[in-house]
Structures are given as structure tokens and as C-alpha cells.
């Protein structure tokens, strides 16, 4: 029999999201960030 | 609230065309996850599945009468549209529409909302 | 198809009992995303059915917790702790794994 349709089965988790950019000195431009649940990912 | 009413001609003969209305509110087809099915159950006897349209348009019928079934939708007049070809006594039942939704967050799979029922007579 | 087998399909009881009602599939129900999706409802005469318990043992929104269900891969029960009189009807199980999704024949609970 085929399947009926159904989720992935997995939750997902709603978290927020934030971009943030730091300055770290005129000759080296800026550092920009994407922290997901408190952990920088990019 | 959520709500769901089902409409129909009531009484048919042999061989005419079913076309069954299933209007609702509280919800909206044009939702993500969100999913209407029809259900029978002819008098005193048990319940059969007989279709399910989504909000994007996927449809799932069942096999033993796919031949005879057309489910469809009009997403912005909150309605689900049911056409069975060539009926029989056979068919003669209680036609329920009822709500699932397929959610990754919220459980929702599952028939939560059922109309009342209406009722088809197929008779000579 | 899948076969919902439903026993017993009458089940007289007295207010205050414990009723079980046994559901078997003729295969798996186990979806492929890892769920079941086994769902147990209550239909009173001249009632839609009403939802009591979905994917295998959660009971839905506002059903009483003297419905529980358990169960896994083919075998599934529904027990009822303490039969009140609001419980009488035809209780049917249902599984949404597989098309055509399909229920049980239905069991009566009813008073002796």
C-alpha cells in the first residue's frame, strides 16, 4: 500500500535568528555573524 | 471556531452523479499543512475513507473507488467539492467531511473536526 | 489494504467498570517518518465521530484521562479505567499510515 502523506516525523524547533557585525579595527574591516540559539554559525 | 457542514441532493437514482459541498470556517485551505477528507458511513454499519484534498492542491483517494471519485477545492470561498459518478444503492451512506492537517510543530494529524453529516438516499 | 480488526465488537459493562477494546492490523502501521498513526474515536448515536486518542496513546484535547491507549506495530488496545455513562457508543480504531486509511468495524460499549 502507498502512504498517506505525513510530516517528516521530526519537530522543529523555532529559534531566533541573529545577524550581528563587529567592528575589529580599521584594517580589517568587519566580522559578520549569524548566531542560531546562541551558537555562531557563520 | 472551527466548524464544517456538508451539503447535498439528499435523494438520487441509480447511475446519476453525487456532487457533495463541504463548507467550512475557523480555518483556511490556504494554510500550509492544512488538509479536508471525506468519510461515509452507511446506516448503521461502520465508517470508510474516502478522499483527501490538501492545501496545495495533493490528493489521495481511495483505490477501491478512485475510478468513480473527484475531489477538489475553492480555497477562497472556504468550500471541498466531492463528485461520485454512476451511484449505486450501494452507496446510499451518511457523507462526512472532516479536518486533518499535517504540522512539524503543533500535532495536529488527525481527524479533529467533523460536520454533521448529510445524508444520501440512492433509490430506484 | 489494511485490515482493522476490532474486538470484541460488543462490549457490555456496568457504570464503574474497566472495558479494554483490542484493535489489530493485518500489517504495520508504522509510517515511514517513524510514527503511527493510530487514532481511536467515539461516535454516539446520531453523532459525527469525535476524536479520543491519536498516535497510538496521546488523547486529545479535552478527552477525560480514564481513556488511555498503548500498543505498537500491529497490536493496539484502548482502555476505558472507570465506564461512565457519557462513555456508552461505538468506539472505532482507525490507522492514517496507509492509503486507503482505514477503520476497525467498531465496537459497542453499552450497559448490561
Known amino acids: 500500500d502507498a502512504e498517506f502523506r505525513h510530516d517528516s516525523g521530526y519537530e522543529v524547533h523555532h529559534q531566533k535568528l541573529v545577524f550581528f557585525a563587529e567592528d575589529v579595527g580599521s584594517n580589517k574591516g568587519a566580522i559578520i555573524g549569524l548566531m542560531v540559539g546562541g551558537v555562531v554559525i557563520a | 471556531q472551527v466548524t464544517l457542514k456538508e451539503s447535498g441532493p439528499g435523494i438520487l437514482k441509480p447511475s446519476q452523479t453525487l456532487s457533495l459541498t463541504c463548507s467550512f470556517s475557523g480555518f483556511s485551505l490556504s494554510t500550509s499543512g492544512m488538509g479536508v477528507g471525506w468519510i461515509r458511513q452507511p446506516s448503521g454499519k461502520g465508517l470508510e475513507w474516502l478522499a483527501h484534498i490538501w492545501w496545495d492542491d495533493d490528493k489521495y483517494y481511495n483505490p477501491s473507488l478512485k475510478s468513480q471519485l473527484t475531489i477538489s477545492k475553492d480555497t477562497s470561498r472556504n468550500q471541498v467539492f466531492l463528485k461520485i459518478t454512476s451511484v449505486d444503492t450501494a452507496d446510499t451512506a451518511t457523507y462526512y467531511c472532516?479536518?486533518?492537517?499535517?504540522?512539524?510543530?503543533?500535532?495536529?494529524?488527525?481527524?479533529?473536526?467533523w460536520g454533521q453529516g448529510t445524508t444520501l438516499t440512492v433509490s430506484l | 489494504d489494511v485490515l482493522m480488526t476490532q474486538t470484541p465488537l460488543s462490549l457490555p459493562v456496568s457504570l464503574g467498570d474497566q472495558a479494554s477494546i483490542s484493535c489489530r492490523s493485518s500489517q504495520s502501521i508504522v509510517h515511514s517518518n517513524g510514527n503511527t498513526y493510530l487514532e481511536w474515536y467515539l461516535q454516539k448515536p446520531g453523532q459525527s465521530p469525535k476524536l479520543l486518542i491519536y498516535k497510538v496513546s496521546n488523547r486529545f484535547s479535552g478527552v477525560p484521562d480514564r481513556f488511555s491507549g498503548s500498543g505498537s506495530g500491529t497490536d493496539f488496545t484502548l482502555k476505558i479505567s472507570r465506564v461512565e455513562a457519557e462513555d456508552l457508543g461505538v468506539y472505532y480504531c482507525?490507522?492514517?499510515?496507509?492509503?486507503?486509511?482505514?477503520f476497525g468495524a467498531g465496537t459497542k460499549l453499552e450497559l448490561k
Open positions: 482507525f490507522q492514517g499510515s496507509h492509503v486507503p486509511l482505514t
Open positions: 472532516a479536518r486533518r492537517s499535517i504540522n512539524s510543530v503543533v500535532p495536529e494529524d488527525y481527524f479533529d473536526y
